[in-house]
C-alpha cells in the first residue's frame, strides 16, 4: 500500500511567494513621474517577477511632524486620487498581485509615530485600517515600531481589526531592531504578525554570521511563519557587497517563510553607484536614461532592460527563483533541515512529503571548497541521495539539469547551488 499523503497546511496568499516593497513611488518610476497611475503601468513588470504582493507607500497626506495635518484616509495629491488608487487595486487584482498599504503615520518627519501624541495617532490608525479594508486593500504595513510606545498592544489591536475583517488580510510590522529577544517579544504577543527587521543585517560584510543567525531564528520561532529580509525598508546593497547578492537571493527565496524585497533588489540597485541619490530610495534603473544626471554612470547591465536580455543576470536569477518558490511544495511549505558542509558553507534541505526535494548549498567563502555534506546530521525523513540534479547555480558555467555527485560537490568562491532530487520511500 502507498504511504498516506501528509495533510497540506492552510496556505495564505503571502505564504506563496515574495513581497515587493515600493516605499517611494517617485524613485521607483523616475523621470519626474511617480504617481499611482504610473505605477499601474508597471504592474506587468511586477507580474514578470512573480511576486505575490506589493507593499506600497506610505502615500497618505503627511505634513512633516504635524499630527493635525496628517490624514491616513487621504491620498497625498502628489501621488494621485482615491480613484487612481481604486483603479490600481482593480488592475493588481486582475494580475493576482495583492496590495499592502503602508500606514506609517509621520513618514516625512523625524519620529514616525509622533511620540508625544501616541493615543491620537493610534486612533487615526484604527480608523484608517477600517477605511482601507473597506476600500479593498489586502493588508497593511507599519514601520519603525520601536518608536511606538506599547507597540505590542497596539499591534494586537490592529491585528484584530485586520483579521476580524478577513483571515486573508495581512499585517506587517517593521522594526530597525536586530536584537533577537526584542523581535521574539514582538512576535510572541502577535500570533499572525509578519515582522520585518534588521536581524539579518548583522550577518557581516562577508556573510560569516548568516548561517548561525538563520538557524538561531528558526529554532527560536519554532513552527511560526516568518519573513526574510535584511531590513524593514532598505535595499540589499545597503548591507551586502555585490558578490553576496546572488547568494542572498537564493537563500531568501528558499528559506521557510516569506521573502520580502525592496524595489531594485532584483537588479542589484545600488545607491552608492549613483552619485547624489539618497541611500534609502535611489532612482530605479529601468534603462540607461533613468539616471541622466551623470552621463555614462549607468551601464546597460545595471538596468532592468539590460538584465532582462541577459539570462545570466541577477534579474533573471530573481525571476527563476521566484517562479520556483511559488510552485514547488517543498519550497512553499516544506520542512527545513540545515546540516554541516564545511567552513563558510551553509547547506540545508527543503522537503515536503513525497514531493520533489531541494538541496541548497551556499558558499559564503571567497575560496572554492569541496562540500563535505554531513548527511548524518539529517533525520531519516530527509536523507540525501548520491546524486541530485542541478536546478541552478548563482554563477555561470555549470550545466543545468545535469546530475551532480554529492560526494564530489565543489563550489566556486561565493557560489550558491540549488539542487533537486526526488522523494525515495
Amino acid at each position: 500500500r502507498a504511504p498516506r499523503c501528509r495533510e497540506l497546511p492552510a496556505q495564505k496568499w503571502w505564504h506563496t511567494g515574495a513581497l515587493y516593497r515600493i516605499g517611494d513611488l517617485q524613485a521607483f518610476q523616475g523621470h519626474g513621474a511617480g504617481n499611482l497611475a504610473g505605477l499601474k503601468g508597471r504592474l506587468d513588470y511586477l507580474s514578470s517577477l512573480k511576486v505575490k504582493g506589493l507593499v506600497l507607500g506610505p502615500i497618505h497626506k503627511n505634513q512633516k511632524d504635524d499630527v493635525a495635518q496628517t490624514d491616513l484616509l487621504q491620498i497625498d495629491p502628489n501621488f494621485g486620487s482615491k480613484e487612481d488608487f481604486d483603479s490600481l487595486l482593480q488592475s493588481a487584482k486582475k494580475k493576482s498581485i495583492r496590495v499592502i498599504l503602508d500606514l506609517t503615520p509621520n513618514y516625512r518627519g523625524e519620529n514616525s509615530w509622533f511620540s508625544t501624541q501616541v493615543d491620537t495617532v493610534a486612533t487615526k490608525v484604527k480608523d484608517a485600517l477600517e477605511f482601507w479594508l473597506q476600500a479593498g486593500v489586502d493588508g497593511f504595513q507599519v514601520r519603525d515600531i520601536e518608536n511606538l510606545k506599547d507597540a505590542s498592544s497596539f499591534l494586537a489591536e490592529w491585528q484584530n481589526i485586520t483579521k476580524g475583517f478577513s483571515e486573508d488580510r495581512l499585517l506587517i510590522a517593521g522594526t530597525n531592531s536586530s536584537d533577537l529577544q526584542q523581535i521574539l517579544s514582538l512576535l510572541e504577543s502577535n500570533k499572525d504578525l509578519l515582522l520585518t527587521s534588521s536581524y539579518l543585517s548583522d550577518s557581516g560584510s562577508t556573510g560569516e554570521h548568516t548561517k548561525s543567525l538563520v538557524t538561531q531564528y528558526l529554532n527560536a520561532t519554532g513552527n511560526r511563519w516568518c519573513s526574510w529580509s535584511l531590513s524593514q525598508a532598505r535595499l540589499l546593497t545597503s548591507f551586502l557587497p555585490a558578490q553576496l547578492l546572488r547568494l542572498y537571493q537564493l537563500m531568501l527565496f528558499t528559506l521557510p517563510g516569506t521573502p520580502v524585497f525592496s524595489y531594485g533588489d532584483e537588479i542589484g540597485l545600488d545607491a552608492a553607484a549613483l552619485p547624489g541619490q539618497p541611500m534609502e530610495a535611489p532612482v530605479m534603473l529601468w534603462d540607461e536614461s533613468s539616471f541622466p544626471d551623470i552621463p555614462g554612470a549607468v551601464s546597460a547591465n545595471m538596468t532592468v532592460k539590460g538584465q532582462s536580455e541577459d539570462p545570466g543576470s541577477l534579474l533573471s536569477l530573481f525571476r527563476r527563483l521566484s517562479d520556483q518558490r511559488s510552485k514547488e511544495r517543498s519550497l512553499l511549505h516544506g520542512d527545513f533541515h540545515a546540516f554541516s558542509a564545511g567552513p563558510g558553507l551553509f547547506s540545508y534541505i527543503r522537503h515536503w512529503d513525497q514531493n520533489e526535494r531541494f538541496l541548497v548549498v551556499l558558499n559564503f567563502g571567497d575560496v572554492g571548497l569541496s562540500a563535505g555534506l554531513q548527511a548524518s546530521d539529517l533525520p531519516a525523513s530527509a536523507s540525501l541521495p548520491a546524486k541530485a540534479d542541478l536546478l541552478l547555480s548563482t554563477q555561470p558555467g555549470r550545466e543545468e539539469g545535469s546530475p551532480l555527485e554529492l560526494e564530489r560537490l565543489k563550489l566556486e568562491p561565493h557560489e550558491g547551488l540549488l539542487l533537486r532530487f526526488p522523494y525515495a520511500a
Epitope: G204, T206, G207, E208, K211, S212, A242, Q243, S340, A341, G342, P343, G344, L345, F364, G365, D366, V367, G368, L369, S370, G372, Q395, P396, K410, E412, P413, H414
Partner: antibody, heavy 119, light 113 residues
Framework: QVQLVQSGAEVKKPGASVKVSCKAS????????MNWVRQAPGQGLEWMGI????????NYAQKFQGRVTSTVDKSISTAYMELSRLRSDDTVVYYC????????????WGQGTLVTVSS | DIVMTQSPDSLAVSLGERATINCKSS????????????LAWYQQKPGQPPKLLIY???TRESGVPDRFSGSGSGTDFTLTISSLQAEDVAVYFC?????????FGGGTKVEIK
C-alpha cells in the same frame, strides 16, 4: 598584537598520534579561520586543512583525509591539529596560520612545531 | 588540485638590482565574477615561518615595503623586488588561494651576488 603560539617539539613512534596546539591572542578567535600547513626541512609548504573556530566546520586536503583532525577550544582561543598513524615522512615542521573569514591566504603564522617520527 | 610551478629555483642578484620571480598555475586563478586573481606571495627566512607579502596577485599586505610588487593574471604571475636589500635574502613562495586544497610553488631562493 596578533600572536599564534604553538606547542613545543615532539618525538613520536611510527603508528602513534600527535596533537599540536596553537594558542591565539590579539584578535577575536572566532572571527578568523585557522589553517594547518606543514613543511619538510628545506622543502616546500603543504596545506593540510582548515577550521572555522566559530562552528568547528572543517575542510581537509584529500591526502590527509581520515588521518587529520582539527578542533578548537573557544574558551581558551586555542586550535589543535591531531595527526594519526604517523609515518617517518611526517617528520616535518607544522604551522598554524590564520586567514580572514572566507579567505585562502594566511596573514599570521605560528612559530612552527617540529614533529619527529622515529622508531 | 591546482599545481603551482615556480621559476627559477634560485636567483643571485646584486644589491640594489631588480629580482624577478615567476609563478605558473595549472589552471586560471582569475575569478570572472570579481575580476581578481587569487594568488599570494610569501617570504620565508631561515628558522622563521613564512610572511605574507602580497595577495590577490598585486595587493601588498600592510607593512610590506613598496619595493615588493606583484603582477600577472590568469596562469602567469610575477613577484618583483625593484631594488634588492640585504634583508630580502630569503626563500619566496607563491600560493593559489582560489580553491581548496591551497597549493604552493616549490620556492625560489634569493641570494646576493
Amino acid at each position: 598584537q596578533v600572536q599564534l603560539v604553538q606547542s613545543g617539539a615532539e618525538v613520536k613512534k611510527p603508528g602513534a598520534s600527535v596533537k599540536v596546539s596553537c594558542k591565539a591572542s590579539g584578535y577575536t578567535f572566532t572571527s578568523y579561520w585557522m589553517n594547518w600547513v606543514r613543511q619538510a626541512p628545506g622543502q616546500g609548504l603543504e596545506w593540510m586543512g582548515i577550521i572555522d573556530p566559530s562552528d568547528s566546520e572543517t575542510n581537509y586536503a584529500q591526502k590527509f583525509q581520515g588521518r587529520v583532525t582539527s578542533t578548537v577550544d573557544k574558551s581558551i582561543s586555542t586550535a589543535y591539529m591531531e595527526l594519526s598513524r604517523l609515518r617517518s615522512d611526517d617528520t616535518v615542521v607544522y604551522y598554524c596560520a590564520r586567514a580572514s573569514y572566507g579567505k585562502g591566504y594566511f596573514d599570521y603564522w605560528g612559530q612552527g612545531t617540529l614533529v619527529t617520527v622515529s622508531s | 588540485d591546482i599545481v603551482m610551478t615556480q621559476s627559477p629555483d634560485s636567483l643571485a642578484v646584486s644589491l640594489g638590482e631588480r629580482a624577478t620571480i615567476n609563478c605558473k598555475s595549472s589552471q586560471s586563478l582569475l575569478n570572472n565574477i570579481n575580476q581578481k586573481n587569487y594568488l599570494a606571495w610569501y617570504q620565508q627566512k631561515p628558522g622563521q615561518p613564512p610572511k605574507l607579502l602580497i595577495y590577490f596577485a598585486s595587493t601588498r599586505e600592510s607593512g610590506v615595503p613598496d619595493r615588493f610588487s606583484g603582477s600577472g593574471s590568469g596562469t602567469d604571475f610575477t613577484l618583483t623586488i625593484s631594488s634588492l636589500q640585504a634583508e630580502d635574502v630569503a626563500v619566496y613562495f607563491c600560493q593559489q588561494h582560489y580553491s581548496s586544497p591551497f597549493t604552493f610553488g616549490g620556492g625560489t631562493k634569493v641570494e646576493i651576488k
